[in-house]
């Protein structure tokens, strides 16, 4: 009992004056609280409380459920307690079978005893199964049995509180331990697609998948630089214990251009946070943008190959593609394919393969592509480089020697005189007249050049060389001269 110090308020005194009292079931419990400032008795078991304003607590026929702590409190807030055990051989445990444990924390199996004199108060596995080897516990007859540092592996563990009474083991009702996992890593988040491109009015829907050990993970879709709450729908699954998956789907039923932006799926738990983003671009209508992969003006040597390559962005998907030359559509020699197999790909490649080009195959090659919203085209001007060809070489009536050559690029014609029968001509002769003949003709064909010299300048036997050349190559034609007296005579020209 408390000792009284004069002048200071003292706790109440309880009769019987002991800390613990054992009564048999059916017997009377009579507890007297003596204090001039008595306020109330409080009875507490399994963390539930009852109050009594009488200073004498009387229970005529004690039951096991009357086991518990009886506390008397005075007006100064001072109190004194006695713990009463109501010994009932048929009910050795009072129980609350709700049993939840947080991983790495302690949890109390609430099975206080009604008889403190039983022995070997402990936990046992159900159906004779042993407890996990690492399970440690501390028994307290007035509260229950504390399991220390709950492990994830204990989830759905079936337990009994157990005592030995008169040499026999007695078990309580079953307890099923439900373990709430501790978060030991950030959530794992992923998004159905990293970017979306839509036309105005189309539906935008994106799904974020959040994986964690329990459904307590928090997740939300956020618009970057905005506080507006977005409407989401959820689906969730428990794939066995501690393997939880949530799908958070964000939908904008009719997207507008100003909905474009970055959307973030954010998830956090007590360990930390993770996020993933997706980009939405909404356009008012579809588009096609073509990017030539080579120069649109192409020079290629006669007989060689060339690939005309374009990349293009098309949204929505391209519906028709064609390559055209001289109003004719290619049915083969070209291929069209997506730049990537990615579902969100809008970039495509088209290649026209031109093989062994002839000088007559220069011209405009056009790629046309269309989708449901727009058409687009790009033209390639193909020039076929050809070695000059001497079309004509003649002595004209007026005594001029004329050479006409065709090729691309435009040939240059030089004249040389070779004395005697030598065909190694070095002395150059300036032409009298040079004309490009077909500048008004088709722009991609061979260019024809005509050059003339005055043959009266030659006073000796010899050979005149007409040499046509360009970047690709050269070709020569020859005029042979022989003088008989004062007469000059043209002997056959030859190449």
């Amino acid at each position: 009992q408390p000792s009284v110090s004069p002048g200071e308020p003292s706790p109440p005194s309880i009769h019987p004056g002991k800390s613990d009292l054992i009564v048999r079931v059916g017997d009377e419990i009579r507890l007297l609280c003596t204090d001039p400032g008595f306020v109330k008795w409080t009875f507490e078991i399994l963390d539930e409380t009852n109050e009594n304003k009488q200073n004498e607590w009387i229970t005529e026929k004690a039951e096991a459920t009357n086991t518990g702590k009886y506390t008397c409190t005075n007006k100064h807030g001072l109190s004194n307690s006695i713990y009463v055990f109501v010994r009932d051989p048929a009910k050795l445990f009072l129980v609350d079978r709700s049993l939840y444990g947080k991983e790495d924390n302690d949890t109390l199996v609430r099975c206080p005893l009604t008889d403190p004199e039983v022995t070997n108060y402990s936990l046992k596995g159900c159906q004779g199964k042993p407890l996990p080897k690492d399970l440690r516990f501390i028994p307290d007859p007035k509260a229950g049995i504390m399991i220390k540092s709950v492990k994830r592996a204990y989830h759905r563990l079936c337990l009994h509180c157990s005592v030995d009474q008169e040499g026999k083991s007695v078990l309580s009702e079953k307890f099923i331990l439900k373990v709430r996992p501790a978060f030991k890593a950030v959530p794992v988040v992923s998004v159905s697609k990293a970017s979306y491109l839509l036309r105005e009015g189309e539906e935008f829907t994106v799904t974020c998948t959040i994986k964690d050990v329990s459904s307590s993970v928090y997740s939300t879709w956020k618009r970057e630089n905005s506080q507006t709450k977005l409407q989401e729908k959820y689906n969730s699954w428990h794939h066995g214990d501690f393997n939880y998956e949530r799908q958070a789907t964000l939908t904008i039923s009719s997207a507008r251009v100003n909905d474009s932006g970055v959307f973030m799926c954010y998830a956090n738990n007590t360990f930390g946070s993770a996020n993933v983003t997706t980009t939405l671009e909404v356009v008012d209508k579809g588009f096609i943008n073509i990017f030539p992969m080579i120069n649109t003006t192409v020079f290629v040597n006669d007989g060689e190959n060339v690939d005309l390559i374009v990349e293009y962005e098309a949204f929505p998907k391209p519906e028709h593609q064609q390559w055209i030359y001289m109003n004719r559509t290619f049915t083969d020699k070209w291929e069209d394919y997506p730049k990537s197999e990615n579902e969100s790909n809008i970039r495509y490649v088209s290649e026209l393969h031109l093989t062994r080009l002839k000088g007559t195959e220069g011209g405009t090659y056009t790629f046309l592509v269309s989708n449901s919203d727009v058409n687009a085209a790009i033209a390639f001007n193909v020039y076929v480089n050809t070695k000059p060809e001497i079309l004509t070489y003649d002595r004209l009536v007026n005594g001029m020697l004329q050479c006409v050559a065709a090729g691309f690029p435009e040939p240059t014609i030089d004249w040389y005189f070779c004395p005697g029968t030598e065909q190694r001509c070095s002395a150059s002769v300036l032409p009298v007249d040079v004309q490009t003949l077909n500048s008004s003709g088709p722009p991609f064909g061979k260019l024809v050049v005509q050059s003339s010299i005055d043959s009266s300048a030659f006073k000796h036997n010899g050979t005149v060389e007409c040499k046509a050349y360009n970047d690709v190559g050269k070709t020569s034609a020859y005029f042979n001269f022989a003088f008989k007296g004062n007469n000059k005579e043209q002997i056959h020209p030859h190449t």
Epitope: D47, T49, D96, S98, Y100, K102, C158, S215, S216
Partner: antibody, heavy 117, light 111 residues
Framework: QVQLVQSGAEVKKPGASVKVSCKAS????????MHWVRQAPGQGLEWMGV????????SYNQKFQGRVTITADKSTSTAYMELSSLRSEDTAVYYC??????????WGQGTLVTVSS | DIVMTQSPDSLAVSLGERATINCRAS??????????MHWYQQKPGQPPKLLIY???NLESGVPDRFSGSGSGTDFTLTISSLQAEDVAVYYC?????????FGGGTKVEIK
């Protein structure tokens, strides 16, 4: 004797939030899990979530994920349920319920929340 | 989520007659033979009241005309002799797995 006393009826506009309280007595507040259940007019019961005894961990019905927050004030033995972004279909009676020996042994009297523009 | 399906939706029984309500879970609510299944009674304007816990245990203060049975996925609430004060809606509930779920309710009336 255990008692759960809830706060009074509320009328809210769509988009607003509501916070319902549940004051507990007759037991050690921190020793028991507190659940929240709602019931729309003429409908059945729907579990919303729980705040666990001891450390205040929570678990929510995914239907309300991101909108519901359950908290507790140990000093006043009061549990709270806040529901945000209210819509008309959130009009319901909201109950707190104490879990005892695996079942919902004690219920609050209910709080009617009406969501109307 | 475990789906709880109650049948029938409503039931009209004469006073003194037996009323039987069934509840089926979409998956077992048992652990080690313990059924985490409870029955509640709700009268208009009142909160639910616990009748039966862990499938077959009668809550303190509930008349013994109420009884519960079943395990695994199939459960039954029986009122052996219907009284006027038993007119109410009855709900089953599982708390084996989060989220805890309720049946849709069965309305019991007097024929």
């Amino acid at each position: 004797q255990v008692q759960l006393v809830q706060s009074g009826a509320e009328v809210k506009k769509p988009g607003a939030s509501v916070k319902v309280s549940c004051k507990a007595s007759g037991y050690t507040f921190t020793s028991y899990n507190m659940h929240w259940v709602r019931q729309a007019p003429g409908q059945g019961l729907e579990w919303m979530g729980v705040i666990y005894s001891g450390n205040g961990d929570t678990s929510y019905n995914q239907k309300f994920q991101g909108r519901v927050t359950i908290t507790a004030d140990k000093s006043t033995s009061t549990a709270y349920m806040e529901l945000s972004s209210l819509r008309s279909e959130d009009t319901a009676v909201y109950y707190c319920a104490r879990e005892r020996d695996t079942r919902f042994g004690n219920w609050g009297q209910g709080t009617l929340v009406t969501v109307s523009s | 989520d475990i789906v709880m399906t109650q049948s029938p939706d409503s039931l009209a029984v004469s006073l003194g007659e037996r009323a039987t309500i069934n509840c089926r879970a979409s998956e077992s609510v048992d652990i080690y033979g313990q059924s985490f299944m409870h029955w509640y009674q709700q009268k208009p304007g009142q909160p639910p009241k616990l009748l039966i816990y862990l499938a077959s245990n009668l809550e303190s203060g509930v008349p013994d005309r109420f009884s519960g049975s079943g395990s695994g996925t199939d459960f039954t609430l029986t009122i052996s002799s219907l009284q006027a004060e038993d007119v109410a809606v009855y709900y089953c509930q599982q708390n084996n797995e989060d989220p805890y779920t309720f049946g849709g309710g069965t309305k019991v009336e007097i024929k």
